[in-house]
């Protein structure tokens, strides 16, 4: 093995090119010196090299930067991005939109993974907020990132990043995500008139307090179904039938198709039969005519 | 989105065959085709290389005057034609598309008996 490791006579690389894809791994590691491969990153991404020969590659970059790359490296790293731990990316200091942007597109298509996943912190930290410009190409790439962040990381989302939202954005969040968003687009959209609040506000909608649902009710927005089965189930509880039926709209009669589900089959349950009878869906479960509702709750907080 | 090769098989030494490296779900066109072969035990290694717009090639020592890399990007496919085989050429031969994303095909046997 001891004469493998010179660089047999005429074979120096001189610039990064396909004849490269020729070589042995070792004449990789002997004869590619690591600062002409540095410099001449972006032609690696349009060279066919094995999987083998990107290992050879990301060796002998790791050996000229060991306390991790420099962006004008990383942003020309292409699908040798692919070849990073997030060992490796959690020594990088990604600050340009353009370096993230490149990377995220070699993943293009696939899931979100570890190393994408460090990136994205590794960027987001950096800024020290999700900025809207960031949020924007996040989502563009991966419809679900919001959701995957905790409430905390989500905290950290400027109100006028919310504009970049889009309702696909929100499929996948759970009404804890909801609670953290739902107050800043309700700040981010408040200078919109009734119906154009309605059609940006609508996918955020389950994390919304009772009081604005009450408020929503007195706007004719006529709520589909599927945004209110949406809703927190705490939050439609105290809603009156006369509230639901205003919140719905024609959307109403889509209550019968739902009433053993929650919240419908719950907010069912504390309304009374009289009431629910005037919508004239033939729900059922509601409480009896007659009979005296405590609110507990209530009794508690007076003791 | 895929590389599909074909035209492996069974030939003599000194017999001729023509591999096809067809993309599937992408376009091939903005990229530059590597073949590559391995053996049995063996590091994979180059075999040859086309650019993008079919105007460079590039061949590994061993098979130069031997084989020939072409493509035509209107039937999306690259094709290798092997002259002159010996029983040394014997490999499971694939390509690869780099120019943005890389693909890899599956790879096809070439017996050389």
């Known amino acids: 093995e001891v004469e493998k490791t010179a660089c047999p006579s005429g074979k120096k690389a001189r610039e990064i090119d396909e004849s490269l894809i020729f070589y042995k791994k070792w004449e990789l590691e002997a004869c590619v010196d690591a600062a002409l491969l540095a410099t001449q990153m972006d032609r690696v991404n349009a060279i066919p090299f094995t999987y083998e020969q990107l290992d050879v590659l990301k060796h002998k970059l790791d050996e000229l930067y060991p306390q991790g790359y420099p962006e004008s490296v990383i942003q020309h790293l292409g699908y040798l991005f692919l070849k990073m731990s997030p060992e490796d990316i959690r020594k990088w200091n990604v600050t340009s939109l353009e370096t993230l942007k490149a990377l995220l597109e070699v993943n293009k298509g696939h899931e979100m993974s570890p190393q994408v996943a460090t990136l994205i912190d590794r960027f987001v930290k950096g800024r020290g907020q999700l900025d809207k410009d960031t949020l924007d190409t996040l989502t563009a790439f991966y419809p679900g990132y919001l959701c995957s962040l905790s409430p905390e990381e989500l905290s950290s989302v400027p109100p006028s990043s919310i504009w970049a939202v889009r309702p696909q954005d929100l499929d996948t969040c759970d009404p804890r995500q909801l609670d953290v968003l739902y107050p800043k687009a309700r700040l981010a959209f408040q200078n919109m008139n009734g119906s154009e609040y309605f059609v940006k506000i609508q996918s955020f909608l389950g994390g919304a307090p009772t009081e604005d649902l009450k408020a929503l009710s007195q706007q004719n927005v006529s709520m589909d179904l599927a945004t209110f089965m949406k809703l927190r189930t705490d939050a439609v509880l105290p809603l009156t039938v006369a509230e639901v039926q205003k919140l719905l709209g024609p959307h109403v009669e889509g209550l019968k198709a739902e009433e053993r589900h929650r919240p419908v089959r719950d907010w069912i349950l504390r309304q009374r039969q009289d009431d629910l009878d005037t919508l004239g869906l033939g729900l059922q479960g509601g409480i009896p005519n007659g009979y005296l509702v405590l609110d507990l709750s209530m009794q508690e907080a007076l003791s | 989105l895929q590389l599909v090769e074909s035209g492996g098989g069974l030939v003599q030494p000194g017999g001729s065959l023509r591999l096809s490296c067809a993309a599937s779900?992408?376009?091939?066109?903005?990229?530059?085709i590597g073949w590559f072969r391995q053996a049995p035990g063996k590091e994979r290694e180059g075999v040859s290389s086309?650019?993008?717009?079919?105007?460079?090639?590039n061949y590994a020592d061993s098979v130069k005057g031997r084989f020939t890399v072409s493509r035509d990007n209107a039937k999306q496919t690259v094709y290798l034609q092997m002259n002159s085989l010996k029983p040394e050429d014997t490999a499971v031969y694939s390509c690869a598309a780099a120019g943005g994303f890389r693909y890899w095909g599956q790879g096809t046997l070439v017996t050389v008996s």
């Open positions: 086309i650019s993008s717009s079919g105007g460079s090639t």
């Open positions: 779900g992408f376009t091939l066109d903005n990229y530059a």
